[in-house]
Amino acid sequence: VSPTFQVVNSIAPVQECSTQLDIVIVLDGSNSIYPWDSVTAFLNDLLERMDIGPKQTQVGIVQYGENVTHEFNLNKYSSTEEVLVAAKKIVQRGGRQTMTALGIDTARKEAFTEARGARRGVKKVMVIVTDGESHDNHRLKKVIQDCEDENIQRFSIAILGSYNRGNLSTEKFVEEIKSIASEPTEKHFFNVSDELALVTIVKTLGERIFALEAT
């Protein structure tokens, strides 16, 4: 060992996404999502792992049900703390239908625009969280292809709660939400038994999102 060698004490930080990514979270806020607190808890746990800022990761949130609302744009907040405060305040907007294709398409066409803070040359990531089959499934194939054409990486999360509560088959639902996820599906698709279980996937989801910058 060289005589100039020094031991430096250091603490390994909690893994953070300190890279440049533009992330838009697309939240199903339709009537069947319950309890909503579980969704905001999931957001909190995911967002606090991110190093958010104009030169680091930016996050925007879109909520959909029978229509769509931009909760906040990519460039609205310039720190993790600010985003966490804003995310906690997001209220469930409800809706008579679950328009997943509309939510995704609005995120692609509007949330990922420079006017709303998207940065040129920065990787685009979409995280879609939903608890039911879409009523605009007939539009989904084209919408996903449009995302693919724009190199938007998609992580999709199926919440099986309302199906399990109603003792309904989840097969078609899971198939639909898998079709939303980027390839390879096994790395981009998640399903949870109910809304409360969302927090259990945060660590893995976070790691997979952060890994994108290395690809």
Partner: antibody, heavy 120, light 107 residues
């Protein structure tokens, strides 16, 4: 390709019955809310009724002139929508269309239509 | 039930003209207002949804505007293939009523 194809139209006497079918393909039919719309000769479009998906109870709504006479149903295993028309009247003569229906997009997919003629 | 009215009921125009059709709902419809084009013997075709969104594949000369109860369809420069009947429809609450239609023919 997303497609709707109606069938079952024809000539029927007043008081008679007819069942129209609409075969769906290219999308997950079981998710969709579906409607029937009709158009009498030389007239405007008239919404007949809607059926929700089975997960929402498959509930139906109908327009006043057909209530109690027309019934909308669906068979998700066959990807088919039906319109059972009983006690037909001459004013039910029209081209009948099936459509995919959402609040946001309205009716963005239509079949080609099937003609129903009620005449003695 | 929500009543939909349209004006004019018919209009004559020439290729290149700017055409405006109005639609009024008897009560607020949360911008769930759609415009359809229909040609004789054919099924209606969605042009505009949610008051102002252009349906995929529809030329940009078609535009929709308005909110609350009053809505407008505009064709910025009429083309030969645009001669048809145009109908508005509310999709806010059943019954999903249509306007009576506006026939656009050649002057």
């Amino acid at each position: 390709e997303v497609q709707l194809v109606e069938s079952g139209g024809g000539l029927v006497k007043p008081g008679g019955s007819l069942r129209l079918s609409c075969a769906a393909s290219g999308f997950t039919f079981s998710n969709a809310w579906m409607s029937w719309v009709r158009q009498a000769p030389g007239k405007g479009l008239e919404w007949v009724g809607r059926i929700k998906s089975k997960t929402e109870g498959g509930t139906t709504d109908n327009v006043a002139p057909v209530k109690g006479r027309f019934t909308i149903s669906r068979d998700d295993s066959k990807n088919t929508l039906y319109l059972q028309m009983n006690s037909l009247k001459t004013e039910d003569t029209a081209v009948y269309y099936c459509t995919i229906t959402t609040h946001y997009y309205g009716m963005d997919v239509w079949g080609q239509g099937t003609t129903v003629t009620v005449s003695s | 039930d929500i009543q939909m009215t349209q004006s004019p009921s018919s209009l004559s125009a020439s290729v290149g003209d700017r055409v405006t059709i109005t639609c009024r709902a008897s009560q607020t419809i949360n911008n769930y207002l759609n415009w359809y084009q229909q040609k004789p013997g054919k099924a209606p075709k969605l042009l505009i949804y949610a008051a102002s969104s252009l349906q995929s594949g529809v030329p940009s000369r078609f535009s929709g505007s308005g909110s609350g109860t009053d809505f407008t369809l505009t064709i910025s420069s009429l083309q030969p293939e645009d001669f048809a009947t145009y109908s508005c429809q509310q999709s806010n609450s059943p019954p999903f009523t249509f306007g009576p239609g506006t026939k656009v023919d050649v002057k």
